[in-house]
């Protein structure tokens, strides 16, 4: 979050939309008058592309220059200075920087430990003083016995058959965030957690190896939930929800074999585990766990470049990267990206000025820092603009950890850019075995929702703002991210074809850039989210006789999809009898298309309280998941099932439907209110 | 209703072997570290093995080591006890028992099977 | 292996009376992991005490175990015809193997 309260020289933010200030990029002697068309566009793309060195690039951010570079370390400084500088060589329309004063959390001098204690807390023996750690950890020294709960979701803790209140967790990394591991933890009133690697999950030969990572469920600086801190705005001191309030630990494998010594019981066959895996301590012995973790303030600075739309500047895809990385591990986890954002940027930079692309809508393209610690960077820009950025971005294409092998390309999307992805995966050939990104005409069963860790999560379940991120990489997990193993040799010896695996993802995210920034019909599938209703309503209509009992209908929320299904229908149609060449009926029909996403954000909380207001992609009880789980409630366990909180879910969610259906449908004329 | 269900028992000659079976139900077999406990007529209790809820760990006492062999098939829910080299102080009533409290190897025994006989004679 | 020596081997009391049983072990046995049984004719043994002094579930409060070291001792506050039987105590904390004590009879005066 932002503090206005630095020196003049202070650069000011969010000027995209300043066109007058603006230079348009220079060009060569160049046709103006012919209009590039797609293949062209794309064959342009292509050859650019094959004279890019992506790897060189990758190598020279992963070398010590520029590492290790923590969220507002001085490396992270000069590399955002770096990446600024290659911006104004691109001549870009404009070139900012965003500067913010955020709370980190970082290791104090004073060692986190992990001991064995008998059963009168008389030391045993140190397992550990690890050198990792996990940001936003409580501080605090916990003793209790010692329950592993295999990776932490809620179904591992259903199948535990033993209760974890008053006790230590211990969890395999993988699977779902650290943050969502301790926050299952917690709400079992478990004591602590302690996070290690098992080697059949993360197959590294120096079992001390430590590693880091962040345990806020949330994104952005968790002591200003869901708001920036500019001083005008005096907000009172803030934390946020997603804060855990038991200390949590990264331990090596080879700290958590020394506690399997200590402990009883076989873990489960199905888990698939190492063979030392125990599940609980002896009842002579207890572990203690000390965290003394400490915040600091830090400045952090995203880097900006735009080049600005020929016909709508004042509409812009949002391009970016994580830049910094904890620990000393930097190539995956943020080099990969960060080069890729420099070199499109250079090759869109070389195709206005050179080749004569003229994008009708702006591309930003955005170095974000602070990303190890929940994508603090990203939100904050966002949390500070999120009135500016609202009918303006429309699409956040992420290019964190886009290559971690090399088997498999997997998507995580919201649902209006599936056709648009379905498309270009038809285009783009995987470098190794020569055929087509689209292996699967059921490819979209399989995306999986964006993950609190992302930086595209935030764009979509707190801005509203359809967002895409894809990577190529294998079934099991890169095993070297969050650790000083995150090298660019490990990365090469993982991923042989990396130069070739790059451009691969740079011809991805080259064609998404311009296909939503020069057709002159928004790229952007509004009727997908009628599938996306319609799976929500078959879910609800299982429990019909419930929803019966309690004396209500489902009848509005039908009535609600119909709605969003005719306006959508109604939207084609005129999209179909619109005139192509008339540019203000087309911005009119695609601004229709730009409140889609951002009116699936429930009008109905706070964004102070629950910032990730979408209802299908968001995080809290308005959203449509939240109702189910809530449903599922009743007749499972009568005693959890809240009826109260039912009723006002039903209410919202219908309301919040029928309020996107008419968004869609246009002008306040154009709505059918006959609901 | 927690069940453990000793069968296999009989008459058998020294030297010769018996399999005991114990058929669990009413809990999650494969949570609970499992024992064979034995009693001679009219003396006391005498732990003969344990294995632990995987199968990955077991042990006997001193007096059938190398003779008899605990297993345990948690797909079946059942436990148990392969008795070779059989002799006349073999002879029991057996129990099989499930540790009281799920994972943990060392820990009393909660749940007990009414026993099987295993009378061993010539 | 660990010995187990109860003591008395036979109990005479009346309902109501307190109970006092012991048991003493060859070596330190870590009070985590000493339990005591009860046995009634004809019956399979039933938990009564695990870790020395936690009571199992459904085990009345009369019932209660104390002790560490080499040193432990099941008490019955007040007797119960119920509580007529043979009493045994387990040590399971060494490396097995495990062992139970002799057990001790506590029987009507």
């Known amino acids: 979050c932002k503090r206005v309260e630095q020196k003049e020289e202070c650069v000011k933010l969010a000027e995209t939309e300043e066109t007058d200030k603006s230079e348009t990029m220079e060009t060569e002697d160049v046709p103006t008058s012919s209009r590039l068309y797609w293949a062209d566009l794309k064959t342009l793309l292509s050859e650019k592309l094959n004279s890019i060195e992506f790897a060189d690039t990758i190598k020279q951010l992963s070398q010590n220059t520029y590492t290790p570079r923590e969220a507002g370390s001085q490396k992270d400084e000069s590399l955002a200075y770096y990446i600024e500088n290659q911006f104004h060589e691109f001549k870009f329309s404009k070139v900012w920087r965003d500067e913010h004063y955020v709370k980190i959390q970082v290791k104090d001098s004073a060692q986190n430990s992990v001991i064995i204690v008998d059963k009168n807390g008389r030391l045993v023996y140190l397992v550990e003083n690890p050198g990792g750690y996990v940001a936003y950890s409580k501080a605090a020294t916990v003793t209790g016995k010692l329950v592993h709960a295999n990776f932490g979701t809620k179904k591992d803790f259903e199948d535990l058959y033993t209760p974890v209140n008053g006790s230590i967790v211990i969890v395999r990394a993988g699977k779902i965030t650290f943050a969502e591991k301790v926050a299952n933890a917690e709400s079992l009133n478990a004591i602590g957690v302690l996070i290690y690697m098992d080697q059949t999950k993360f197959p590294i030969v120096n079992a001390e190896l430590s590693f880091f990572g962040h345990a806020h469920l949330g994104t952005g600086d968790p002591y200003t939930p869901g708001f920036p801190s500019f001083n005008h705005t005096q907000f009172p001191p803030s934390r946020s929800s997603g804060l855990p309030n038991i200390p949590v630990q990264t331990i090596s494998r080879a700290a958590a074999e020394k506690l399997f010594g200590n402990m009883e019981g076989d873990c489960p066959s199905d888990w698939k585990t190492d063979s030392t895996c125990r599940m609980v301590t002896s009842e002579s012995k207890n572990v203690k766990l000390t965290v003394s973790n400490v915040l600091k303030e830090r400045r952090i600075l995203n880097i900006f470049g735009v080049i600005k739309g020929y016909e709508e500047p004042d509409r812009y895809v949002v391009v970016g990267a994580q830049r910094d990385a904890l620990g000393a591990g930097v190539a995956a986890k943020s080099s990969v990206g960060t080069g890729l954002l420099l070199k499109l940027a250079q090759v869109f930079s070389d195709m206005i000025s050179k080749d004569g692309f003229r994008p009708s809508r702006s591309i930003i393209f955005a170095s974000w820092t602070a990303g190890d610690f929940g994508a603090v960077g990203a939100t904050e820009w966002l949390e500070g603009y999120l009135s500016s950025l609202h009918l303006k971005a429309f699409t956040y294409i992420n290019l964190d950890k886009v290559v971690l092998g090399t088997s498999n390309f997997k998507v995580s999307a919201s649902p209006l850019l599936y056709t648009l992805m379905g498309k270009i995966m038809q285009d783009v050939k995987h470098p190794v075995d020569g055929k087509s990104l689209y292996r699967d005409s059921n490819w979209i069963s399989k995306v999986e929702k964006l993950s609190f860790d992302n930086a595209a999560y935030p764009f979509l379940a707190y801005s509203g703002i359809p967002a895409v991120s894809f990577c190529f990489c294998e079934d099991a997990d890169y095993p070297y991210l969050g650790t000083r193993l995150d090298t660019y040799e490990a990365l090469t010896q993982k991923v042989p074809q990396l130069n070739q695996m790059v451009r691969t993802a740079a011809e991805v995210a080259g064609q998404l850039i311009i296909k939503l920034t020069h057709d002159v019909e928004l790229n952007l599938d509004y009727e997908r989210y009628n599938s996306q209703l319609l799976s929500f309503v078959r879910d609800l209509n299982q429990y019909r006789a419930d929803i019966k009992e309690m004396g209500l209908s489902l009848q509005w929320l039908y009535s609600a999809r119909g709605d969003f299904f005719r306006a959508t229908s109604r939207l084609t149609t005129d999209f179909g009898n619109a005139e192509k060449t008339d540019r203000f009926v087309m911005k009119k029909l695609n601004d229709r298309v730009m409140r889609v996403e951002y009116h699936f954000l429930s009008p109905y909380v706070s964004p102070k309280e629950s910032p990730f207001r979408h209802v299908f992609w968001g995080s809290g009880s308005h959203t449509l998941p939240a109702l189910l789980e809530n449903l599922k409630l009743r007749k499972q366990n009568n005693g959890a099932f809240n009826e109260t909180l039912f009723r006002n879910q039903l209410a919202l969610a219908t309301w919040t439907i029928q309020g996107a259906a008419n968004a869609l449908s246009g002008d306040v004329w154009d709505i059918d209110n006959e609901f | 209703e927690v069940q453990l269900v000793e069968t296999g028992g009989g008459l058998v000659q020294p030297g010769g072997s018996l399999r005991l079976s114990c058929a669990a139900s009413g809990f999650s077999f494969d949570k609970y570290t499992m024992n064979w406990v034995r009693q001679a007529p009219g003396k006391g209790l005498e732990w003969v093995s344990v294995i632990s809820n995987g199968g990955v760990s077991t042990d006997y006492a001193d007096s059938v080591k190398g003779r008899f062999t605990v297993s345990r098939d948690n797909s079946k829910n059942t436990l148990y006890l392969q008795m070779n080299s059989l002799r006349a102080e073999d002879m029991a009533t057996y129990y099989c028992?499930?540790?009281?409290?799920?994972?943990?190897?060392?820990?009393?025994?909660?749940?007990w099977g009414q026993g099987t006989m295993v009378t061993v004679s010539s | 292996e660990i010995v187990l020596t109860q003591s008395p081997g036979t109990l005479s009391l009346s309902p109501g009376e307190r109970a006092t049983l012991s048991c003493r072990a060859s070596?330190?046995?870590?009070?985590?992991?000493l339990a005591w049984y009860q046995q009634k004719p004809g019956q399979a043994p039933r938990l009564l005490i695990y870790?020395?002094?936690s009571r199992a579930t459904g085990i009345p409060d009369r019932f209660s175990g104390s002790g560490s070291g080499t040193d432990f001792t099941l008490t019955i506050s007040r007797l119960e015809p119920e509580d007529f039987a043979v009493y045994y105590c387990?040590?399971?904390?060494?490396?097995?193997?495990?062992?139970f004590g002799q057990g001790t009879k506590v029987e009507i005066k």
């Open positions: 387990q040590q399971y904390g060494s490396s097995p193997p495990w062992t």
């Open positions: 028992a499930r540790a009281s409290q799920p994972w943990l190897y060392r820990t009393g025994a909660d749940v």
């Open positions: 070596q330190s046995v870590s009070s985590s992991y």
């Open positions: 870790g020395a002094s």
